[in-house]
Interface confidence: low
């Protein structure tokens, strides 16, 4: 807490500018004017202050605005927005998607922090749903975005914003996740030719259910090994030795690396050994 | 409700050893929580992932910190993880968490956030 003391003759300041990095945090408290700073806040980041300085500048905004900083000032916060904390950021009421941009770049590189996740968090619920600016958005600063978030919360994100999606988006997401984004995919693409729809639906097939890994059989796909072992379990474990070879084309000498891992470990105790012996990789049921 | 249970905590001087454990009440993987390790936090710190394994194969993931003293292994029978813990220094005082989650690598172990299931923790001291 600052302590309030009357600003030195002269030292009042008439616009936020680089002499007052020269200020001794009482004299940023007495002379800065908050209402001031609120229609300046753009300059505050082309300015070198200290951090506790920053500290200062962020006390003046909290008792100008102590309901929550409007989105003009929270647009041009620049790096004061890495002293905000998450109950700051519960109070703000953020719409645009360059507010939001904006703040990113200033987290940029580093780690989702809990601010971001705040901010995030009451910008989709602000939009009620993730659509597919916003995921463009997100994903962009943070592949692992889309796997952060529950299977609850994925199941607001609408269909048209998966094609937003890369599949280094979805490299940690975990079953569950994928079994609600699968079907927004499967809905999303169903209009493209069969090999482009391969290309696209891929990196989703962790959520596809037996039904579908057939239907793919008969398609030529040649799915990679990578692919294969994402799938999930129960969903393989149906599927017959030449529903696999079809589907794996030549890349079902792959097994042989596998055999020990599920869901191949398990797909091959489910199947008759005359039927594996078809497939000469030496597979034992 | 999926618990995982963790034991092996305690007081020790600087170079000795101690052995964590815990141990899923189910088989993960089935979930494709194919990820178990531990994370941990000293006091007014982050937390920070220490070691993980990815269940079934074996592949491990190291912090650099730990590199060299820790070693993480399974016992897929018994649904545990063990992390034995050597030339302890006191920087590695901290409460340690067991967590599991899916990844991709086991690379991936890293992120908090991504974590499935999380352990009550188990505090190591380690005095000079």
């Known amino acids: 807490e600052v302590e309030k003391t009357a600003c030195p003759s002269g030292k009042k300041a008439r616009e936020i500018d680089e002499s007052l990095i020269f200020y001794k945090k009482w004299e940023l408290e007495a002379c800065v004017d908050a209402a001031l700073l609120a229609t300046q806040m753009d300059r505050v980041n082309a300015i070198p202050f200290t951090y506790e300085q920053l500290d200062v500048l962020k006390h003046k905004l909290d008792e100008l605005y102590p309901q929550g900083y409007p989105e003009s000032v929270i647009q041009h916060l620049g790096y004061l927005f890495l002293k905000m904390s998450p109950e700051d950021i519960r109070k703000w009421n953020v719409t645009s998607l360059e507010t939001l941009k904006a703040l990113l770049e200033v987290n940029k590189g580093h780690e989702m922090s809990p601010q971001v996740a705040t901010l995030i968090d009451r910008f989709v619920k602000g939009r009620g749903q993730l659509d597919k600016d916003t995921l463009d958005t997100l994903t962009a600063f943070y592949p692992g975005y889309l796997c952060s978030l529950s299977p609850e919360e994925l199941s607001s994100v609408p269909p048209s914003s998966i094609w937003a999606v890369r599949p280094q988006d979805l490299d940690t997401c975990d079953p569950r996740q994928l079994d609600v984004l699968y079907p927004k995919a499967r809905l999303a693409f169903q209009n493209m030719n069969g090999s482009e729809y391969f290309v696209k639906i891929q990196s989703f097939l962790g959520g596809a259910p037996t039904e579908d890994l057939k239907a793919l059989s008969q398609q030529n796909v040649s799915m990679d090994l990578a692919t294969f072992m994402k799938l999930r379990t129960d969903a393989v474990l149906p599927l017959t030795v030449a529903e696999v070879q079809k589907l794996l084309g030549p890349h079902v000498e792959g097994l042989k690396a596998e055999e020990r891992h599920r869901p191949v470990r398990d797909w091959i105790l489910r199947q008759r050994q005359d039927d594996l012996d078809t497939l000469g990789l030496g597979l034992q049921g | 409700q999926v618990q995982l249970v963790e034991s092996g905590g305690g007081s020790v001087q600087a170079g000795g050893s101690l052995r964590l454990s815990c141990t899923a009440s189910?088989?993960?993987?089935?979930?494709?929580?194919?990820?178990m390790g531990w994370f941990r936090q000293a006091p007014g710190k982050e937390r920070e992932a220490v070691a993980a394994i990815y269940t079934g194969r074996g592949t491990t993931y190291y912090a650099d910190s730990v590199k060299g003293r820790f070693t993480i292994s399974q016992d897929n029978a018994k649904n545990t993880v063990y992390l034995q813990m050597n030339s302890l220094k006191p920087e590695d005082t901290a409460m340690y968490y067991c967590?599991?989650?899916?990844?991709?690598?086991?690379?991936?172990?890293?992120?908090?956030?991504?974590?499935?299931?999380w352990g009550q923790g188990t505090q190591v001291t380690v005095s000079s």
């Open positions: 189910e088989d993960l993987s089935i979930y494709g929580y194919n990820c």
């Open positions: 967590a599991s989650k899916y990844c991709a690598v086991v690379a991936d172990f890293g992120n908090s956030r991504l974590v499935r299931y």
